[in-house]
Every structure is written in structure tokens, then in C-alpha cells.
């Protein structure tokens, strides 16, 4: 079974419609607010999963530290414009024409500007830290059970390939993951680590969008690996353009 | 692809005892959610036991508290449904079932939306119970 033929329900998204119309009738399903058919053996893209929403009603020191052009997505939620892959479109305009660029995961990269502002690609983001800091637990996590059970997960509820988890760090209470894919990395049918790191960040927050109704359960060991705040930092593979303005604000 | 194959139904006197095993071909079915479910004539699938990937957490029909045991190894990827005390109620299809999702945790077993949860589903093991 893929998108669950018996009950016809998309897995991997529930910001979906689904319905027996595909071929030979089997189960179809679309994303909500695009329409776009989405393949509910995989992740979906972030941009879908956006546009879906907004549719919606409403001992040594081993912790990595982000770089100068790493990005924070402080702008949050917006509706984007996907392209027919579901990909971000490089422009995003709202709707007073306020126009900016942004990466593959979506976050603003440069100064926002207007209708004649131009986005010449699309940046690859190559490399995501997330950054984790657990609640207390009775002693710290072993670090290469924790390691190894951060890189199953992202393996078996992501479906993403091992060799894109670049590093699993760990100083209690902060945990710290880095995904890393480069376009040439990245084969057909892989799935983005923007989408991952997206799929996971939902989870971790508990706002699970795959289509079970339990959430995500994450354990070390058999004790609960529960997160009191996250931060994700992106990198690109051309670094962010903004004025010095807003560096020195 | 999650396959599982379950083993141990059979005939039974009232009162008897038996075990169910299913064995799973997929070794990500060791962080699933996994249930047994019974299907007679003309009825709904209905949920038996549920038990969590780290086996730790187990949930069960009212009908068969107390007579039931579920548990799981996941060095083995087997599950295992212990059945003592049983009564011509349980005469059944019985099926072993893996969540969608890895990493999920369990539904209720008395949701009726529980079905959705569970794709993945082995043949069946009939188990007959007589008076």
C-alpha cells in the first residue's frame, strides 16, 4: 500500500483530499490549497505543505557554531508560490507587492522589495542545523545511542538517505543535528532535508502532518527524548544578500 | 515493503490457551506501533491488543483484559499475542497489523478511526474456540 488503497488516506500528509480517482481507481490525493496530486510514499514539499496551511482556517566542546550567513526563519508562515514540482518559486510576492527571494526551504534571503525586484535562481540551502535543547532527565542520554537513534529516525519516519545526516552533536541538554545534501548530492526520488528538517520541526512541536493521530515517539534507550525549544539555522550554498542596514539593526 | 505473516491459530477447547506469533520482513517495523485485530463473518475488523515500538506501552480490547498478552521483540521483529482463558467469543480471523508511520504513537484501541492508522496487515490465522 501507498496512499492506504483499503481507507484511501495519504500517510505522509493529512493537508490532503483524497479520493479513489486515479487510475484503475486507486487512491489519489491532493495537496489543500494548490490541488496539486502529491505521492504519499514520501514526504511532501515544504512549499505544498505552506500553501496547505495558510489554506487552512486559521569534553571537548563539540556544539556547532551557526555560521556569519546562516539564516533563522524569523519571518514565519506566508503563502507561497510553488512551481508545478511544488518547489519554492526564487520571488515571493504578498499581497500588497512587497516581493523578496528565497532559498529551497523557503526563507527569506535578501532585503524585501517590490514588483521589480529580481530572483534569478533558486539558492540551494546545503546545509541545516537544528538545534535542540531537551527537557531534564534523570542523567545525560549516551551520545552514540542518541546519535544512533536520531539517524534511524531520520532514515525511517523521513525516509531520508543516511549519508545526508552529516552529524548528530551532543552536550547536554543540547542536541544538535546537521543535514547536509548539495545539488549534486541530491538524486531523483531523495528526499530534500528542507523537507525533512520541516517534517521534523512539526513533529517536534506536535503538529505532526502525517496522517496517524498519535504524534511523534521518540525514544533513547526507552526514555522519552522530549524537546523544550528548537532553533534551525539554514545555509545556502551562495550566501544571503542584505544590506548592511539590517546587519548592524 | 512492510510484510508480516502471522502463525499459532488453530483449534481450541474453551478454557485452552494459544499463541499467536507474526514476523515481519521489515526491519523499520521495529520502531512501529504494531496491533492484532479478529475479523469474524459479516463483522467489522475490530482491535485487540496494541502494544508500542519499545514495547513498553499496551493498550487492550475490554473483551479480552486480563485473558491476553501482547508483546513484541524487536531484535527478532516478532510479535507475539498470548491467549489463555479462551471462550467461543474469540473465534475469529486474527490479524497482525503495522502503523503507517514509524515513530508514531499508538492510537486508542477503541478508535474508530483506528483502521487508518494500520495499512500494513498479514494474511490471518484462524483461530476456532468450542464449547
Known amino acids: 500500500h501507498t496512499a492506504a488503497q483499503d481507507n484511501c488516506t495519504c500517510p505522509t500528509n493529512k493537508m490532503t483530499v483524497c479520493s479513489p480517482d486515479g487510475p484503475g481507481g486507486r487512491c489519489q490525493c491532493r495537496a489543500l490549497g494548490s490541488g496539486m496530486a502529491v505521492d504519499c510514499s514520501t514526504l511532501t514539499s515544504k512549499c505544498l505543505l505552506l500553501k496547505a496551511r495558510m489554506s487552512a482556517p486559521k569534553n571537548a566542546r563539540t556544539l556547532v557554531r551557526p555560521s556569519e550567513h546562516a539564516l533563522v526563519d524569523n519571518d514565519g508562515l506566508y503563502d507561497p508560490d510553488c512551481d508545478p514540482e511544488g518547489r519554492f518559486k526564487a520571488r515571493q510576492c504578498n499581497q500588497t507587492s512587497v516581493c523578496w527571494c528565497v532559498n529551497s526551504v523557503g526563507v527569506r534571503r535578501t532585503d524585501k522589495g517590490d514588483l521589480s525586484l529580481r530572483c534569478d535562481e533558486l539558492v540551494r540551502t546545503h546545509h541545516i542545523l537544528i538545534d535542540l535543547r531537551h527537557r531534564p532527565t534523570a542523567g545525560a542520554f549516551n551520545h552514540s545511542d542518541l546519535d544512533a537513534e536520531l539517524r534511524r529516525l531520520f532514515r525511517e519516519r523521513y525516509r531520508l538517505h543516511p549519508k545526508f545526516v552529516a552529524a548528530v552533536h551532543y552536550e547536554q541538554p543540547t542536541i544538535q543535528i546537521e543535514l547536509r545534501q548539495n545539488t549534486s548530492q541530491k538524486a531523483a526520488g531523495d528526499v530534500d532535508i528542507g523537507d525533512a528538517a520541516y517534517y521534523f520541526e512539526r513533529d517536534i512541536k506536535g503538529e505532526s502532518l502525517f496522517q496517524g493521530r498519535g504524534g511523534l515517539d521518540l525514544r533513547v534507550r526507552g526514555e522519552p527524548l522530549q524537546v523544550e525549544r528548537t532553533l534551525i539555522y539554514y545555509l545556502d550554498e551562495i550566501p544571503p544578500k542584505f544590506s548592511m542596514k539590517r546587519l548592524t539593526a | 515493503q512492510v510484510q508480516l505473516q502471522e502463525s499459532g491459530g488453530g483449534s481450541v477447547q474453551a478454557g485452552g490457551s494459544l499463541r499467536l506469533s507474526c514476523a515481519a520482513s521489515?526491519?523499520?517495523?521495529?520502531?512501529?506501533?504494531m496491533a492484532w485485530f479478529r475479523q469474524t463473518l459479516g463483522k467489522e475488523r475490530e482491535g485487540v491488543a496494541i502494544?508500542?515500538?519499545?514495547?513498553?506501552?499496551?493498550r487492550y480490547a475490554d473483551s479480552v483484559k486480563g485473558r491476553f498478552t501482547i508483546s513484541r521483540d524487536g531484535t527478532k521483529n516478532t510479535m507475539s499475542l498470548q491467549m489463555n482463558s479462551l471462550e467461543p467469543a474469540d473465534t475469529a480471523m486474527y490479524y497482525c497489523a503495522a502503523a503507517a508511520i514509524p515513530y508514531e504513537r499508538c492510537p486508542d484501541i477503541s478508535d474508530p478511526q483506528i483502521l487508518v492508522s494500520f495499512p500494513y496487515w498479514g494474511q490471518g490465522t484462524q483461530v476456532t474456540v468450542s464449547s
Open positions: 521489515d526491519y523499520s517495523t521495529g520502531r512501529r506501533c
Open positions: 502494544i508500542d515500538y519499545a514495547g513498553t506501552s499496551t
